[in-house]
């Protein structure tokens, strides 16, 4: 996990989230997303 401090004084937390592909479809492997401020963006 990485934490970035911006000039605005806010802290934005970036967290990598990993899901199994078979939970959402038929593919194998892992799906990696990035959560920024509580929202998964990728």
């Amino acid at each position: 996990d990485a934490e970035f401090r911006h000039d605005s004084g806010y802290e934005v937390h970036h967290q990598k989230l990993v899901f199994f592909a078979e939970d959402v479809g038929s593919n194998k492997g892992a799906i990696i997303g990035l959560m920024v401020g509580g929202v998964v963006i990728a």
């Epitope: 967290q15 939970d23 892992a30």
Partner: nanobody
Framework: EVQLVESGGGLVQPGGSLRLSCAAS????????MGWFRQAPGKEREFVAA????????YYGDSVKGRFTISRDNAKKTVYLQMNSLKPEDTAVYHC?????????????????WGQGTQVTVSS
């Protein structure tokens, strides 16, 4: 509900191997993604590895990739963690846990059920 009991921990020399087991009770074992976490004294619980419901997909924490292998036997309701090339920094209590499918497998909050853990000590 799922109860989890780990076994297989112990004292091993650096470079050695151990195989941990996690036996589950309850009829719903096969609907859970399963994971291993570890906690060293004074440190936060750390994600080690996870395996999907079918066993066809796995994912590993960076610190154990290439050394540890997770597997499962749904008929026996058991999850395994084969640990090779052990290092002193692998010393910790290892916990098995069950996660709801569709939730992130690398975060503690996804896991509803936890075992008490088994101690692994890597020392010469």
């Amino acid at each position: 509900e799922v109860q989890l009991v780990e076994s297989g921990g112990g004292l091993v020399q650096p470079g050695g191997s151990l195989r941990l087991s996690c036996a589950a009770s309850g009829r719903t074992f096969s609907i859970y993604n399963m994971g291993w976490f570890r906690q060293a004294p004074g440190k936060e619980r750390e994600f080690v590895a996870a395996i999907s419901r079918s066993g066809s997909s796995t994912y590993y924490g960076d610190s154990v990739k290439g050394r540890f292998t997770i597997s499962r036997d749904n008929a026996k309701k058991t999850v395994y963690l084969q640990m090779n090339s052990l290092k002193p920094e692998d010393t910790a209590v290892y916990h098995c846990a069950a996660a709801r499918f569709g939730t992130p497998i690398n975060t503690r909050g996804s896991y509803d059920y936890w075992g008490q853990g088994t101690q692994v000590t890597v020392s010469s």
